[in-house]
Every structure is written in C-alpha cells, then in structure tokens.
C-alpha cells in the first residue's frame, strides 16, 4: 500500500488508478495514506473519474476515509440517486490524515479509464465552527498556519485550558455610601471558570444594606446546595449564602461597615447572574434647627454620619460663635450621632462706633449710638475752617460690617482746611510797610534755623517756601524751628511745628542764580486750623487773570524794614506786578549776570521804589485775591532782588508759583 508523502515533506501530489490514462485491470486494490502536519488537513479533488457504475458502488469504487469516518464512496461517471461520482467536488480530511482506497472487481462490461486526483495539505481554520457547535474560543479566536489561539476581552484572562475566558473580577472596592454591583456581563450570561471578589468598605459607623434587584439566575442543582456556581456574602460578624437558583435573595442588613461578596463559576452553564444595589445607614444626628435670621442648607429628612449642613445668614446678619466672627459654618455628623460643632448665631451686623473724624464730628442719624446694619451716621467738618473733601459725609452700616459712604468708600471722609481766608479787606495802594492785624495773614509761617525766613502754610501739614531759605537744612529737617499763628516774631505765644522732610526743587542750584527757587516742607503733624492759622490757596488755572501787569499782590514778613532791623511785628506791603520785560531789563545791568530773571519768576514793586520785600522775608508768599472765589492764593514766593531793598528802578523778584503746580501736587500726593 503506497503511503504517499508524510510531513515534514511537502504534502501535495497526484494519485491515479493503475494504468491511467489507460483502462484499469480487474481485481485491483490500491490504498494510499496521506498525512499532513498537525493543524493542517488534506484537500483532494478529481480531474478525471471513470469507474464502473454499480448499485451502491459495490463493484468498482474509490473510498475516501479520515480516521474511522468514511467521507465518500465513489463510482460511475456522474452521480445518481444512490451512487456518487466526485464531479467537481472537493474533499477534506477531518484531521491531518486521509485514506484513499481504489478497488476493481473481477470483471468490467466495458473498459474504464479509472481516475486521476490531486491532493494538497492546507491549514485548518479552527475558528470556523458549524452552526450549533460550541465555539472554539470563549471570546476571540485567532487562526494561523498549523493552529489557532484564543484571547480575551479586557477585564478577562485566559484560563489554563487555553479556551475559556475567566473574568478579572477581584479586588474591586466600593467606598461610596451607596452603589451597585453585579456579576460580570450582567444581564448577559456570566463568564465561566471565574472567581470574583467584591469589597464594600465604608467608614466606621456606617452599616451596609444589600438588596438583590431585577433578576437572579445562578446555576443550581436540584439536590445539592449550589455545587456549580455560587454567591457568598461575608461580614466581620457572619456569612450569608451560598446563593444560587432563580429566586431573588431577601434584603441583607449586615450591621457592618465592611462586606465581602464572593462569586465562583464553573466551566459550564449559561446563566445571567445577579445585581445588588447597596445602601448604608448610620445613627442619625439631631435635626439642625436654624438660628434666627439664618437657614440650614441642604435640607434633608435626616442627617447621618458624614452628612453635613451649612448655616447661611440673611443679608445684614453675620455668623458669630460668641464674639468670634466666622465667614462660613459647616457642621458634620459624627459616628456617635452628634454634630462636630455647636450651632452659631446669626447676629445683626454691628459696624461698631464710627472712627473719630479729625477736624470734624459724627452724628448718629438712625438713633443715639445705633451702629447696626443699615444704621446711618453723618460726618461733618468744623465749620468755617474745614470743608469735606469728595463725599457728603453720609455713611451707612453695610452688610460687610463697614461704614460705607454713598460712593462706596470705606475710608473716612477728609476734612480739608479751607484755604485763602483772611480778615483783611483790601484797601487802595499803601506806600510803605503796614503792620498786620490778627487774621490778616494766617498762612504766614516763621522759619528759624540759622537765618530768619518765611513760608506759607499749604493744607494743614505742608509749608511752601523758597529753596534758598532752607537749603542748608535739606539734610537735617528737624533743625528747622517752624512757628505759626503769631504776629510778633519774638512772642512766646505761637503754634510750634516741626519738619519731617524738606523737598527742594531738583532744578534749583544753590549760589548759581535763583531759577526754581521753590521748596516744600512736610510737617510731622497736622496743625489745627483756626482764624490765626489758615492755609493759603494754590493758584487755579485761571489765576493768571489776577496776576497781570499792575495787578496788586501782597507780600508779608518779618524781614528788614527801612530802619535796617528785622521787624518785631508782621509787616505787609501791597505791590503791583511789573511787566516781565521791564524787570528783565532792570537786572541785565551789572552787577547782575545776564539771564538773572527767568520765565519762572515774576517781579513786583514800584518803579520809584520804597515798597519791597527784604532779607528775612525770603520764602514768604506774594498773595493775590481771586475775586471769583474770594479766596487769597499764592502767586509768588519771595526770592531775591537788589542789594538795597526798595531801590528805585529795581524790583522784588518772586518765584512764579503757577509754573510749579504739577511739582507741588506730585510731591504732596507722593509723600
């Protein structure tokens, strides 16, 4: 019996009846055994077939068998109702071997030419299964030359039998206070050969409640308790189960905060499994009663362990625990059924007594001493000498606990001194110095510190003066002795002020002319404004209209008089402004260097002389009356002039203050 090729030789070839293509002889029997590699099968088809036809192919035949199974018995040329010829059919071995038997009987009625067939090994696709047959693999089947392998979906692992997918269903821990868990794939059939462990682990104080929901279907047995697949529930106190069958188990109140659920399946069956909805309970806390003027959120029927509530106060009320304010309040229910902190109060917001207003006063509008939410107070400034800056002085106690103006400001209003008030009524031109009366020049400041000089009060804590008058003290501001509120230079009755800082114009160069001869002194304390101490106004933009040539300004000071001594009493002189070109020309003759008079200066005095400021008046203000506001303002600062004061054809030279308004404002706002 020819065996034909065997693996590992190439498995393919040709088979033919003896004598083919001639007729075959009688009484022939020939057998071929073909063997393919493992995982392969054999394919056979006929290119020629001509055998004697007989009933059920009893005389001559070709028989194909694979193992114990006969695949076909073939004869004739074409198939009939009871006999089969191969025609164009292809035959496949069931495994990796195929037996072919050819037999002819003792006679042929006519010559038959037999058969010719071709065979070859081909890969078996193990992944294709006939309808109704169990699939090769649980999840995914992968064919390859000579074999196949199985793989599993995510969340599964291939069992050691290499075909079944076991669920990776252990180690899941549920920590929420409620939730759902189910058998893998629920409500589809659960996987075979799996062992699942689920844990519910809640904080101590909680008790887990298990409810089986929807459907329950776990493989069972009529006589033995859950021998195949089963569900078990374990707590630190007891074990529940095993459960199987089709009946939903009853609710399980575990009285435990930890539960372990075990689900084990075998290799067979087709069941949908189970679903559990779990909840938890704990000892409830006392129901929170909101304090007056407050409310609780969230509102719940009951509050148990870990539940919390917050208190929110109505507008105008604040959370207080005794005297201590809280921005927020949240209490948490503890395992022993008590809240972790006591209820606060919602107390009406109290803005407290309003701050005192320097140079002003406060009046309670709502009621005497009422400082709670929506209470109104009215600030006002001391009349005559102070005026309120920016706001109207009305403040309301707002919900944030701050007194707040109608403009939303939480800071105090400012009582700003009224500037430019004087007791003096201007008369006509007066030739020669006059003695000042009380209240005539309340801005006048006497500066002592090496030499005698003057200055003018600005606001209530600044003095405007000449740079040359305080140059020596620029680094030792505290050496300046500043006096105000007096007419007599040597009087012991005056208001003392001390300097905190001296600011000399950066464009001023000492001993090199008097351009930019301007300085500011910051006082270390505010002075109290009254009829004898009042600041001078700074010039408005429109001030130039009151400072034209021949307009009268007034200079005051304790400087040298005609007698050559410093004045004991404050003196003043009314002098007209001199045309700038005329003044420039007056100081272009020797001994004055060219360009002595700059655009930052103005000149005042009489051509005939006799009225002038002099040494000791330096830094004092040359003031003008603004007839629109009826306030005095500083137009010039006593700076320099001829060696002989009041000399004919020479004039007093003053720093032109209007040119320095930005400089003054910047320093005052910065410091």
């Amino acid at each position: 019996t020819p065996l034909g090729p065997k693996w590992p030789e190439p498995v393919f070839g040709r088979l033919a009846s003896p004598g083919f293509p001639g007729e075959y002889a009688n009484d022939q029997e020939r057998r071929w055994t073909l063997t393919a590699p493992p995982g392969y099968r054999l394919r056979l088809y006929f290119t020629h077939f001509d055998l004697e036809l007989s009933h059920l192919c009893e005389y001559d035949f070709v028989k194909l068998s694979s193992g114990a199974k006969v695949l076909a018995t073939l004869c004739g040329q074409e198939s009939t109702d009871t006999e089969r010829a191969p025609g164009k059919d292809t035959f496949y071995s069931l495994g990796s071997s195929l037996d072919i038997t050819f037999r002819s009987d003792y006679s042929n009625e006519k010559p038959f030419t037999g058969f010719e067939a071709f065979y070859a090994a081909e890969d078996i696709d193990e992944c294709q299964v006939a309808p109704g047959e169990a699939p090769t693999c649980d999840h995914h089947c992968h064919n390859h030359l000579g074999g196949f392998y199985c793989s599993c979906r995510a969340g599964y692992v291939l069992h050691r039998n290499k075909r079944t997918c076991s669920a990776l269903c252990s180690g899941q821990v549920f920590t929420q206070r409620s939730g759902e868990l189910s058998s893998p794939e629920y409500p589809r059939p659960y996987p075979k050969l799996s062992s699942c462990t689920y844990s519910i682990s809640l904080e101590e104080g909680f008790s887990v409640i298990l409810d089986f929901v929807e459907s329950f279907d776990v493989e069972t047995h009529p006589e033995t308790l859950c021998p195949y697949d089963f569900l078990k529930i374990q707590t630190d106190r007891e074990e529940h189960g095993p459960f199987c069958g089709k009946t939903l188990p009853h609710r399980i109140e575990t009285k435990s905060n930890t539960v372990t659920i075990t689900f084990v399946t075998d290799e067979s069956g087709d069941h949908t499994g189970w679903k559990i909805h779990y909840t938890s309970t704990a000892q409830p806390c006392p129901y929170p009663m909101a304090p007056p003027n407050g409310h609780v959120s969230p509102v719940q029927a009951k509050y148990i362990l870990k539940d919390s509530f917050s208190i929110f106060c109505e507008t105008g009320y604040e959370l207080l625990q005794g005297h201590l304010p809280l921005k927020s309040f949240t209490a948490v229910c503890q395992k022993d059924g008590s809240w972790d902190r006591p209820m606060p109060a919602c107390s009406i917001v109290d803005c407290g007594p309003p701050d005192d207003l320097p140079s002003g006063r406060v009046e309670y509008i709502t009621g005497p001493g009422v400082t709670t939410y929506k209470a109104v107070i009215q600030y006002s400034c001391e009349e005559t000498f102070y005026t309120m800056k920016v706001n109207d002085g009305k403040y309301v106690c707002e919900a944030d606990g701050f007194w707040t103006s109608s403009k939303g400001e939480k800071s105090l209003p400012v009582c700003e001194p009224v500037c430019g008030l004087s007791a003096r009524t201007t008369g006509g031109r007066i030739y020669g110095g006059q003695k000042a009366k009380p209240g005539d020049f309340p801005w006048q400041v006497l500066i002592l510190g090496g030499t005698t000089a003057a200055g003018a009060l600005l606001y209530d804590n600044w003095v405007l003066t000449a740079a040359h008058a305080v140059y020596e003290q620029k680094h030792d501001a505290s050496a300046l002795d500043i006096r105000m509120g007096t007419l007599k230079r040597l009087s012991p009755h005056y208001t003392q002020a001390w300097s905190e800082a001296v600011f000399i114009h950066e464009g001023y160069t000492h001993d090199a002319g008097f351009d930019n001869d301007i300085a500011l002194i910051k006082l270390n304390n505010k002075v109290v404004i009254n009829s004898n101490i009042t600041p001078i106004c700074l010039p408005r933009k429109e001030a130039e209209s009151f400072m034209r040539t021949d307009d009268i300004g007034t200079a005051s000071g304790w400087g040298l008089t005609q007698r050559g001594f410093l004045a004991r009493n404050l003196m003043y002189v009314d002098i007209p402004i001199v045309d700038h070109q005329k003044c420039t020309a007056a100081y272009e003759k020797p001994p004055y260097p060219r360009g002595s008079v700059t655009a930052n200066m103005l000149c005042a005095g009489l051509e005939s002389g006799g009225k002038d400021s002099c040494r000791g008046d330096s830094g004092g203000a040359l003031v003008f009356l603004d007839s629109e506001t009826e306030r005095w303002f500083v137009g010039g600062i006593v700076s320099w002039g001829s060696m002989n004061c009041g000399e004919a054809g020479q004039y007093g030279v003053y720093t032109k203050v209007i040119n320095y308004i930005p400089w003054i404002e910047n320093i005052i706002s910065d410091f």
């Epitope: 809280l326 921005k327 902190r341 701050f402």
Partner: antibody, heavy 115, light 107 residues
Framework: DVQLQESGPGLVKPSQSLSLTCTVT?????????WNWIRQFPGNKLEWMGY???????SYNPSLKSRISITRDTSKNQFFLQLNSVTTEDTATYYC????????WGQGTSVTVSS | DIVMTQSQKFMSTSVGDRVSVTCKAS??????VAWYQQKPGQSPKALIY???YRFSGVPDRFTGSGSGTDFTLTISNVQSEDLAEYFC?????????FGSGTKLEIK
C-alpha cells in the same frame, strides 16, 4: 498645616510704639476666622488684645482701645499689631492665634519694655 | 468684663487618677468656652472648644462640660505628660477673657 509665626523687636523703649508681625502659612487670612493677638505677662496671666477678621474688621480689648491698632497685608498673608505709648507694664510674650474651631497659636515672641 | 475664675491655683493628682479642673464665669457665656493646656516654655495648646467639643488629635481622656457660668475640664486616667497649666477662656463677648490658670502636679 496652618502655621503662625510672630516677629518683631524684643526690646522697646517706654513711650515708643511696639510693632509685631504675624506671618501665616498654610491658610489664607481672608478665607475665614478671626486673627488674634494675645499676650502673656510674667506670671502667666493671659490677656486677649484684639483681632482682625477675615473681612478686615477689627475688635479690640477696650482696655487697650486708645493704644492698639491691628492691620493686615493680604498679599503677604500677614497681620500686624501696633501698640502705642508702651510702658514697662507691656512687657510680655506676645502670641498671634486663630481661636475657636480651628485653633492655632504661634510660638510667641518675648517683648521687654525698658529704657 | 467677664471674669473667669479658676479657684484652684494648684491641683495634685496621681498617674491613672481622674481629675476635674473648674472654671466659673461672672456672667452667662452660653457654651462659648475653650480650655487650653500650657507646658513650660511652650505656647498654649487648645484642648476643648464650645465647652465640650474636643479638638482633633486631643486624647479622649480630656472631656469638657458645662454651660452658662460653670465649666469643668475632666482628665480621666491622668498621664505623666498631662503635667501642665490649664486655662479656661470665654469668647462670648468683648473682651475675650482667660482664667488665671490651674497648675496640675503629678504626685
């Protein structure tokens, strides 16, 4: 963790002002609570001086009201104590603290008032 | 001002004993009372707030009770590390005030 740290001069002359800083880490002073200054005199007597709340409002011990000021710098998460016109009676260890349900104290800073 | 009176300046006890420190307010302070423990060279450490609420990390042998004007700090099973001075404090109204302190001595 919330931490409070006091800082300032250990010696102040009578009639001068005492200025202390409390630097807070781990919690914003605008988030909640009242931020207090407390002092402990030799002999261990404790005195509450005042607080500045999360909103910036202040409350002072009436016995100190004319001399005390508590302010804050929210950008630096600091609050400050200024006590004016000090005398030898103000010699103490000064603490900054949050009181009530969140209770943290600084380590304290010793201040001596002496000429 | 509300005066918080701790009448006992010193208390002597043994390890394992139970001891009660008392504090009396001169007027009603509701439950707005805190208790502090201060060891030498350290800043005060809060034990109890709102009369009976224990701060986290405070051993449960420390318990507070009382309301209105009478308050008690109880230490059950006293330990050697409890040697300290104990202060009560009211925060019901301005000014907040402290008791004068009770020193606990271990026999």
């Amino acid at each position: 963790d919330v931490q409070l740290q006091e800082s300032g001069p250990g010696l102040v002359k009578p009639s001068q002002s005492l200025s202390l800083t409390c630097t807070v880490t781990g919690y914003s002073i605008t988030s909640d609570y009242a931020w207090n200054w407390i002092r402990q005199f030799p002999g261990n007597k404790l005195e509450w001086m005042g607080y500045i709340s999360y909103s910036g409002r202040t409350s002072y011990n009436p016995s100190l009201k004319s001399r005390i000021s508590i302010t804050r710098d929210t950008s630096k998460n600091q609050f400050f104590l200024q006590l004016n016109s000090v005398t030898t009676e103000d010699t103490a260890t000064y603490y900054c603290a949050i009181l009530y349900a969140m209770n943290f104290w600084g380590q304290g800073t010793s201040v001596t008032v002496s000429s | 001002d509300i005066v918080m009176t701790q009448s006992q300046k010193f208390m002597s006890t043994s390890v394992g004993d139970r001891v009660s420190v008392t504090c009396k307010a001169s007027q009603n302070v509701d439950t707005n009372v805190a208790w502090y423990q201060q060891k030498p060279g350290q800043s005060p450490k809060a034990l109890i707030y709102s009369a009976s609420y224990r701060f986290s990390g405070v051993p449960d042998r420390f318990t507070g009770s009382g309301s209105g004007t009478d308050f008690t700090l109880t230490i059950s099973n006293v330990q050697s590390e409890d040697l300290a001075e104990y202060f009560c404090q009211q925060y019901n109204s301005n000014p907040l005030t402290f008791g004068s302190g009770t020193k606990l001595e271990i026999k």
